[in-house]
Amino acid sequence: QLPPGKPEIFKCRSPNKETFTCWWRPGTDGGLPTNYSLTYHREGETLMHECPDYITGGPNSCHFGKQYTSMWRTYIMMVNATNQMGSSFSDELYVDVTYIVQPDPPLELAVEVKQPEDRKPYLWIKWSPPTLIDLKTGWFTLLYEIRLKPEKAAEWEIHFAGQQTEFKILSLHPGQKYLVQVRCKPDHGYWSAWSPATFIQIPSDFTMND
């Protein structure tokens, strides 16, 4: 029977910069029941606070609701693991909410085959940013990535769309049914999950671009 091993806060994520959650990995439990607590203070403060919500994020997590989340202040936090034999602390972690945003997937994915008379046909893909992300403030730059593949294929074809919310693809196999998905990330954040797949049937007379 030993004191607990050192825990590690390994992940923090915010869906929209208004709330965030951090998760820790317990160290060894020393063969005894172990309690974990996360304490934090914000830059410029000395007063320590305990995690406001250990429930919302699931096991070994701390969730900071709206009233506890500030984009203007860096959070300094650590986890304390305690059992009957003693305690151990994680390293201090510094968190700036701006840099942990993982948005929801883009919305309203629309896919259409365009066959202009005077040009090669193409697949036109359009989507909207996730609703929780406020792009009007200017500091949030969302980048997009598209993936598509024929329904029965194993490999995805990936295209980086940059900041645009529509994209053209010229090279497609005629007569195939394609799956199309899109995801997004802030410049200094994390990729969202892929959006639900949209299916599109490519006409047999679609002329493939060389």
């Epitope: 590690e8 390994f10 992940k11 923090c12 990995r25 830059e43 410029g44 984009m71 203007w72 860096t74 390293d91 972690l93 510094y94 968190v95 700036d96 701006t98 840099y99 942990i100 403030t137 200017g138 500091w139 990330k185 200094h188 994390y190 990729w191």
Partner: antibody
Framework: EVQLVQSGAEVKKPGSSVKVSCKAS????????IHWVRQAPGQGLEWIGE????????NYNQKFKGRATLTVDKSSSTAYMELSSLRSEDTAVYYC???????????WGQGTLVTVSS | DVVMTQTPLSLSVTPGQPASISCRSS???????????LHWYLQKPGQSPQLLIY???NRFSGVPDRFSGSGSGTDFTLKISRVEAEDVGVYFC?????????FGGGTKVEIK
Amino acid sequence: EVQLVQSGAEVKKPGSSVKVSCKASGYTFTSYWIHWVRQAPGQGLEWIGEIDPSDSYTNYNQKFKGRATLTVDKSSSTAYMELSSLRSEDTAVYYCGRSFFTNWFAYWGQGTLVTVSS
Amino acid sequence: DVVMTQTPLSLSVTPGQPASISCRSSQSLVHSNGNTYLHWYLQKPGQSPQLLIYKVSNRFSGVPDRFSGSGSGTDFTLKISRVEAEDVGVYFCSQSTHVPFTFGGGTKVEIK
């Protein structure tokens, strides 16, 4: 304890390439961005770029875009900085640095001296 | 790119006396999220740089309280209230508001 251990000094010919490694330990490698900074002899610090080890997403200083390539090997918790088309002005100590969930970095490697000389 | 200009280039200080280093940026360092990402590093002789101050005025973990940072917009200052022998080295300001991140040219602090 968080550690960033860099590869040893290199002497290279002009026009060649160099690949510097930065092995991370003491934390979950994929959690935090790795930055690369260089320091020419007796000079200030110059930021080369950064990489997110979780998905290999990179941001480069335009000055080095096309010549510097940042990569990671998640299986060995190692970050790499490759610089091609070397010239004498690239002679410098190259540092890797690690951020928190922030855009500034608090942990640095010990540095790797790259000398470019014919 | 944002140019960071530090003054003075070097500083010779008597132990126990104060020291002040100035850093000026060529454009505002206020990020569109409202934060100012101006930091100070110290590079001791033969060592890698170490973080002293982040976001203008916040001491990093373990940094003695004789170090303080201040400023806003484009003008920033690092102060050492009472210089000690272990404070010798080159001090760099750095901004991470704009990509590419940039550093000042450095201020060499020596003990008289």
